[in-house]
């Protein structure tokens, strides 16, 4: 498992090319999904086939901003949705207490460097209780694919490690020890420690979220400025697991 974590973390270290040629990335989404009224649903997007650095992900419903995950500032949820929207898993978004009014198009907008903006579309249909039982099936292809990819990668790594161990047992010992130490170090990130490239972490400079401790004029200015955003951070979102 440590090897897996290390591999995923290492993906985030890939250097983006200096000049953008063509946008090669693709966004896989959960597609058209349906869910039960009163229930919850996970909106998931996955950016792949690019080495571009993800700097921010916006979630929008039609032209309304639901949430932002910023590499420096962490998660921020719109005030009109803060009781019903939860960040994650990953860069996804969880919608709770669904109503029929939640039916519609949702967009994940990946801001990347140097490629630019990638947009994924999900159509959500909120159904009355009994009709929605088949809804979860729509999510299986993407989540299954992601899980399968991880399993394949982990298996490949384990096989390679096992074979290499047989051939070069002594050398692997020292290398593995070193990697294990690095891996353990990454599991112990603290807010004061520099975060790895692409991780979406709450910035130390703004511990109370985008408003900081200035609850008055500055927050009012930000609310007016953004119309829809509530500036309280909701923790971390990891970009480095996202590009494949």
């Amino acid at each position: 498992m440590r090897w897996c974590l290390l591999l995923i973390w290492a993906q985030g270290l890939r250097q983006a090319p200096l000049a953008s040629g063509m946008m090669t990335g693709t966004i896989e989404t959960t597609g058209n999904i349906s869910a039960e009224k009163g229930g919850s649903i996970i909106l998931q997007c996955h950016l792949s086939s690019t080495t571009a650095q993800v700097t921010q992900v916006n979630w929008e419903q039609q032209d309304q901003l639901l949430a932002i995950c910023n590499a420096d500032l962490g998660w921020h949820i719109s005030p009109s949705f803060k009781d019903r929207v939860a960040p994650g898993p990953g860069l996804g978004l969880t919608l709770q207490s669904l109503t029929v009014n939640d039916t519609g198009e949702y967009f994940c907008i990946y801001h990347t460097y140097p490629d630019g903006t990638y947009t994924g579309r999900i159509f959500l249909e909120v159904l009355e209780s009994s009709v929605a039982e088949h809804g979860a099936r729509f999510q299986i292809p993407l989540l299954g694919a992601m899980a399968a990819t991880l399993v394949v990668i982990c298996t490949a790594v384990i096989v390679v490690v096992a074979l290499t161990r047989k051939k070069k047992a002594l050398r692997i010992h020292s290398v593995e020890g070193d990697l294990r130490r690095k891996s353990a170090g990454q599991e112990e990130w603290s807010p004061s420690a520099p975060s790895p490239p692409g991780s979406c972490v709450q910035a130390e400079a703004a511990p109370a979220g985008l408003c900081g401790e200035q609850r008055g004029e500055d927050c009012a200015e930000l609310h007016d400025y953004f119309n829809v955003l509530s500036y309280r951070s909701l923790g971390n979102c990891s970009f480095f697991t996202e590009t494949g």
Partner: antibody
Framework: DVQLVESGGGLVQPGGSRKLSCAAS????????MHWVRQAPEKGLEWVAF????????YYADTVKGRFTISRDNPKNTLFLQMTSLRSEDTAMYYC????????????WGQGTSVTVSS | DVQITQSPSYLAASPGETITINCRAS??????LAWYQEKPGKTNKLLIY???TLQSGIPSRFSGSGSGTDFTLTISSLEPEDFAMYYC?????????FGGGTKLEIK
């Protein structure tokens, strides 16, 4: 009120250096990405450099890459542009601008500071 | 880089009229185009971003439309204070690029 005030401009010789500053007030500086944009005499606007709120992302225009360095001091609410190996074509009015939180559009601009590169 | 061609470069109109300014991108920039107003002695002002979203505090006579490569800024019922320089900027991808500008003058 959001305010951005640039300083540090002036006359510089070709090959010389200059450091521009942008003092920000009226908002939580550490939460916003910042841009430098310039405008040569009788010309249009040209984006120069960008730095994200926590300095994790820094980008430059090809015309200044390797010569200019953008940085920020969040506790002091100040943005910087260190310019080296200056050329006559760098002569321009330099503006700092705040990035919107959601997109790379620039929602507040300073008045600008003038840099003239000439011998 | 994305080239932005702005037209016309010069426009004369009278207060009360409706005018349009166009920007064309050399490749698709989705909806990510912003419009700015530049006036002597004042700081540049963001009018529209993401193609059609009105920036807070900007009068509703300003509107933006378009997506892909073709975008339009419309100012309906021109006010005396609207006569200024206008620029468009793509904020879709690095490096961010501007149009050449449109000077709007009183006829």
């Amino acid at each position: 009120d959001v305010q951005l005030v640039e300083s540090g401009g002036g006359l510089v010789q070709p090959g010389g250096s200059r450091k521009l500053s942008c003092a920000a007030s009226g908002f939580t500086f550490s939460n916003f990405g910042m841009h430098w944009v310039r405008q040569a005499p009788e010309k249009g606007l040209e984006w120069v450099a960008f730095i994200s709120s926590g300095s994790s992302s820094i980008y430059y225009a090809d015309t200044v890459k390797g010569r200019f360095t953008i940085s920020r001091d969040n506790p002091k609410n100040t943005l910087f542009l260190q310019m080296t190996s200056l050329r006559s074509e760098d002569t321009a009015m330099y503006y700092c601008a705040r990035m919107r939180l959601d997109y790379y559009a620039m929602d507040y601009w300073g008045q600008g500071t003038s840099v003239t590169v000439s011998s | 880089d994305v080239q932005i061609t702005q037209s016309p470069s010069y426009l004369a109109a009278s207060p009360g009229e409706t005018i349009t300014i166009n920007c064309r991108a050399s490749k698709s920039i989705s909806k990510y185009l912003a419009w700015y107003q530049e006036k002597p002695g004042k700081t540049n002002k963001l009018l529209i971003y993401s193609g059609s979203t009105l920036q807070s505090g900007i009068p509703s006579r300003f509107s933006g439309s378009g997506s892909g490569t073709d975008f339009t800024l419309t100012i309906s019922s021109l006010e005396p204070e609207d006569f200024a320089m206008y620029y468009c900027q793509q904020h879709n991808e690095y490096p961010w690029t501007f149009g050449g500008g449109t000077k709007l003058e009183i006829k």
